[in-house]
Interface confidence: medium
Amino acid sequence: KLTIESTPFNVAEGKEVLLLVHNLPQHLFGYSWYKGERVDGNRQIIGYVIGTQQATPGPAYSGREIIYPNASLLIQNIIQNDTGFYTLHVIKSDLVNEEATGQFRVYPELPKPSISSNNSKPVEDKDAVAFTCEPETQDATYLWWVNNQSLPVSPRLQLSNGNRTLTLFNVTRNDTASYKCETQNPVSARRSDSVILNVLYGPDAPTISPLNTSYRSGENLNLSCHAASNPPAQYSWFVNGTFQQSTQELFIPNITVNNSGSYTCQAHNSDTGLNRTTVTTITVYAEPPKPFITSNNSNPVEDEDAVALTCEPEIQNTTYLWWVNNQSLPVSPRLQLSNDNRTLTLLSVTRNDVGPYECGIQNELSVDHSDPVILNVLYGPDDPTISPSYTYYRPGVNLSLSCHAASNPPAQYSWLIDGNIQQHTQELFISNITEKNSGLYTCQANNSASGHSRTTVKTITVSAELPKPSISSNNSKPVEDKDAVAFTCEPEAQNTTYLWWVNGQSLPVSPRLQLSNGNRTLTLFNVTRNDARAYVCGIQNSVSANRSDPVTLDVLYGPDTPIISPPDSSYLSGANLNLSCHSASNPSPQYSWRINGIPQQHTQVLFIAKITPNNNGTYACFVSNLATGRNNSIVKSITVSASGTSPGLSAGA
């Protein structure tokens, strides 16, 4: 199919464009170009007859068009009016016509833009500034750049007038930046020179430095004032309301107590017309004053807050000292002193950090102490404790539960039964309970200051029958002659008798056996291997009784001194040596052998075939119990004689 391609499609004024013909048919008579989307004799640009190779200009010919034998049309020195459609009319030898249309667009080469502003010296927080990108150009796109970045998103920035105008509402000092605009169309892009926005601001509240306000007689007072301001501020100093001088710094040498008073720095901005002042009170001491402690946090929360205690006043060239609980500061990673020792910071306070804290100022003769300061550390609540610890009750008794959780300020308590709120008290009392009062009893402790809550849940069972008890142990694998074991009969029940049996017998009398906690706990001191028995606890009341399953105590012991068998120590040459080692131990020990000090194998049995006199020597068996951490050994001497030299020798194994 006959097609026209415009190269380029977007053409700059003054440049040229080629209307390139694709798929031109064979056997042509000629062709003709027209301006527009159809064949119109009045708008013919040029015609071409192939046979004569003759090009004939038409009414629309401008003298800038060149036609090529392949039917392509070059238009030079493009003007704005050239924009639009172009139609090629092809006449074949058989006089059948074919048409194709192409198009291009003409854009001007853009000039370098510039920025105009409606306000060259806007005042912060008061004025708006409108930047306009010049000139106004048709079919151009306008872009803005701030510090060579695209525009940030801000409700104070507004584009209007087809993005040609950038308005900054309520300018701030942060709007002081380099602004550029850019114009773009399909054939060119140009960027303006920078415009620097000069925002007038301030003065802010001046800062007087240094910050210390306490001085000793004889020192020099050198105060400096600074206020952020554009243009820079003009400064004036007043002492006790009386004007002193118009300088940024105030210097008074060799001050006396009479120089105490209020020192005011006034900053003035002549462009904004604004004044700001800051006052500092200077105290000149004849001698060091009594120090006092200030805190940045009067109610710190445990494990969350840090507290900075500062020793006041700040005095140059002074040594500051600190005491906690009437002792000098302990070494702790949570205690930090500032470089001048004036500020003591407690990182992540705990309830133990309450103090008291004292600071001191050292002078030539003595140390002046501050009054003690106590921290009010907010903590908790910790996990509440519900008492008594009974979990089983008989019907008909009164249930009285008390809840307590360490907390500052004291916790507020709530009780829930099976998830339902009951009352907001520390104690819960239910008279004449029945089985229906069985359930989950939750105490909730809340600290109103920290906003933290903690809960403890207790299962209460009301039943005439006692449950089957169970035994808990504080040590499942005690070591002989070293550990004690405490067995506790669970659960704890009210008005209940606790009983114990060992191997089905009642408890033997022994100074190593001790009952406590209302016979609920049985303690075995210095356990021995003979204590490895079956222990049963029982509970009983006037209605029922029940026994636990037996718990067998697994006592770790040994290894005892090993025994090597057979006991023979003399062997004939040629016999087999088969030594076995055994040691009483729980768990079973690990065995190893050494012959004449040289390690052999890690087995219980040592076997050597056809021994000779070379096998004479010391045979040592070593035993170790990894669980008890204990070791033991025994040494046996073996003598091997040449065959037949001495009667009565063993023939070996």
Epitope: D418, T434, S438, G439, L440, I460, T461
Partner: antibody, heavy 124, light 110 residues
């Protein structure tokens, strides 16, 4: 012998109130929390609520709140369920039950005694 | 509400097989040493029957091939050797707060 038996109409019209009664025998209902559980056809079990016959205290599942009422008649050792504004979705087998008559246990919501169930169909 | 997720929703096994059903709670149903999870068996047309209470305790009269275990949020119900009479739907139920049941597991014999 400990038993629970549900009774009531098997057919209820939409928007009407479903009423069922559970009669206990072999024990005194005042000593236990009494519950209702239902099971729509081919579906799982849904707990409706409990009543404490001793004082009339009740607690209902949030799903049924506002539509359900449980009442007790300790003189007859019975308790009842009323479910208002019923729709076809309330068609189910309704069971009364209670906890821990045969087992010493430690929570009120635990069911080892059940009625045989009563099928209630909601249809016009 | 604590949500119960029971799996699988159905399963087939042969006589003598070991069968395991699990139930997961959306938050812990354990408190003060107890796990408030119970298991029921329901055969067609009958009321549910309590098998296991407080996670692992066998209800009186229930065969010892049924067992339960678990704590916190995850619980398991096991039939050690499946018998023909065990064809039923099994439900878990918690009683840590207002009770809710699992959606059930339908057990069939292949």
């Amino acid at each position: 012998q400990v038993q629970l038996q549900e009774s009531g109409p098997g057919l209820v019209r939409p928007s009407q109130t479903l009423s069922l009664t559970c009669t206990a025998s072999g024990f005194n209902i005042k000593d236990y929390y009494m519950h209702w559980v239902r099971q729509p056809p081919g579906r799982g079990l849904e707990w409706i609520g409990w009543i404490d016959p001793e004082n009339g205290d009740t607690e209902y599942a949030p799903k049924f709140q506002g539509r359900v009422t449980m009442l007790v008649d300790t003189s007859k050792n019975t308790f009842s369920l009323r479910l208002s504004s019923v729709t076809a979705a309330d068609t189910a087998v309704y069971y009364c039950n209670t906890r821990g008559l045969s087992t010493m246990i430690t929570t009120r919501w635990f069911f080892d005694v059940w009625g045989q169930g009563s099928l209630v169909t909601v249809s016009s | 509400d604590i949500q119960m997720t029971q799996s699988p929703s159905s399963l087939s096994a042969s006589v003598g097989d070991r069968v395991t059903i699990t139930c997961r709670a959306s938050k812990s149903v354990s408190a003060s040493g107890y796990s408030y999870m119970h298991w029921y068996q329901q055969t067609p047309g009958k009321a549910p029957k309590l098998l296991i209470y407080l996670a692992s305790n066998l209800q009186s009269g229930v065969p010892s091939r049924f067992s339960g275990s678990g704590s916190g949020t995850d619980y398991t119900f096991t039939i050690s050797s499946l018998q023909p009479e065990d064809i039923a739907t099994y439900y878990c139920q918690h009683s840590r707060e207002l009770p809710t049941f699992g959606q059930g597991t339908k057990l069939q014999i292949t």
